[in-house]
Interface confidence: low
């Protein structure tokens, strides 16, 4: 099977993760969206939107908030008060069935570490934002996957922008391609 290239981001405990996932609104405006984490080889759905989606009607599951803007093809994910145990691989997906999802982006490997006292960025109000935009599908022997384009690392205490080009990826079996824990 083909493995997705994951991108690694480091956060301190207490920080908030903000992720924006664009999707093709013509295809997926009325679809449910989900935020998933890999546990072993199996994706675990942590939160999913209702159907039909309503603009700016947030779905909250614990520390995770999903806000779908179907008129604009935008899913916003927020994970607050990050903990060490949140480390892993995450993805935005179009949720169609527990065993069939359209994965929108390369997985992001989240690494949450304990912040030493006085370390900038260790407070709950410190947030790093990740922009995720649909990826161009690349031909592979296994399931279609994306290759990363640009990762811009801003200075400490700043923010991170991740962007990948093109249009959404269609993956029929998420378990074939995602190996490690995920985060967005």
């Amino acid at each position: 099977t083909t493995e997705l290239t994951e991108e690694k981001y480091e956060y301190k405990e207490g920080q908030t993760l903000e992720v924006k996932c664009d999707y093709a609104l013509e295809k997926y405006a009325n679809s449910r969206k989900a935020w998933q984490k890999m546990e072993g080889k199996m994706p675990k759905i942590l939160a999913k939107t209702e159907r039909p989606s309503e603009n700016s009607h947030p779905v909250q599951v614990g520390r995770i908030t999903l806000e779908d803007y179907p008129d604009h093809g935008l899913l916003q994910v927020r994970m607050t008060n990050l903990q060490v145990e949140d480390s892993g691989l995450y993805q935005c997906v179009i949720y169609q069935h527990p065993k069939e999802s359209h994965v929108l982006f390369n997985p992001i490997c989240l690494v949450v570490t304990k912040g030493s006292s006085g370390t900038p960025g260790s407070s709950e109000n410190s947030t790093q934002n990740v922009y995720r935009t649909p990826s161009t599908t690349a031909k592979a022997l296994g399931p279609r996957y994306t290759s990363p384009r640009t990762v811009t690392q801003a200075p400490p205490e700043s923010t991170v922008v991740v962007s990948t080009p093109g249009s959404e990826i269609n993956l029929t079996n998420v378990t074939d391609i995602i190996r490690v824990p995920v985060f967005n």
């Epitope: 664009d22 609104l25 700016s56 803007y69 008129d71 935008l74 927020r78 947030t127 935009t133 922008v161």
Partner: antibody
Framework: QVQLVQSGAEVKKPGASVKMSCKAS????????INWVRQAPGQGLEWIGE????????FYAQKFQGRATLTADTSTSTAYMEVSSLRSEDTAVYYC?????????WGQGTLVTVSS | DIQLTQSPSSLSASVGDRVTITCSAS?????MHWYQQKPGKAPKLLLY???NLASGVPSRFSGSGSGTDYTLTISSLQPEDFATYYC????????FGQGTKLEIK
């Protein structure tokens, strides 16, 4: 209807700071991102940064990191931007905008003039 | 940052003309948004996510494109369309094109 109403024009000396406001109405303030964009006289549009009023989290253009500060008061549905260490090239109209995938509503703008 | 280059920078046209403005990105972006600005006014959203008309925008405006090349088309110019047009991308740090000024011939 959705409205973003910005504070009035400001004249500042080089090195000073300016704080402007953007009062939102007609929608749930915490559901949308507020962006700030500026436009120097006769020039194009330049993105400064954004704030999520619900969480207070911010994201800045690298050029403005450390010099612009975005805040939001959810009790009054008002977003604020403070720009410090003003220089003459900061003379511009500053707009607040509401963002989803694009900036669908804009304030009328606040003209900031920096002159000695 | 992704640079956006609009072409042409200025354009003279007549009422009823079909006008095309292009926006070229320095690297691939997912979508392009377009704004219209008239002198002394705030910009107004015309098209979002490449081809979707914003609320209240006439159907003579249309957008297309993908990757690095995007187009805004006005099928039949009306007097109120003379303005400056900006493209805008959000596939990373947000950037705008330098603007295209559409003037009456």
């Amino acid at each position: 209807q959705v409205q973003l109403v910005q504070s009035g024009a400001e004249v500042k000396k080089p090195g000073a700071s300016v704080k402007m406001s953007c009062k939102a109405s007609g929608y749930t303030f915490t559901d949308y991102v507020i962006n700030w964009v500026r436009q120097a006289p006769g020039q194009g549009l330049e993105w400064i940064g954004e704030i999520y009023p619900g969480s207070g989290s911010t994201f800045y253009a690298q050029k403005f990191q450390g010099r612009a500060t975005l805040t939001a008061d959810t009790s009054t549905s008002t977003a604020y931007m403070e720009v410090s260490s003003l220089r003459s090239e900061d003379t511009a109209v500053y707009y607040c905008t509401r963002r989803m995938a694009a900036m669908d509503y804009w304030g009328q703008g606040t003209l900031v003039t920096v002159s000695s | 940052d992704i640079q956006l280059t609009q072409s042409p920078s200025s354009l003279s046209a007549s009422v009823g003309d079909r006008v095309t403005i292009t926006c070229s990105a320095s690297s691939s972006v997912s979508y392009m948004h377009w704004y219209q600005q008239k002198p002394g006014k705030a910009p107004k959203l015309l098209l979002y996510t490449t081809s979707n008309l914003a609320s209240g925008v006439p159907s003579r405006f249309s957008g297309s494109g993908s990757g690095t090349d995007y187009t805004l088309t006005i099928s039949s110019l009306q007097p109120e369309d003379f303005a400056t047009y900006y493209c805008h991308q959000w596939s990373g740090y947000p950037t705008f094109g330098q603007g295209t000024k559409l003037e009456i011939k």
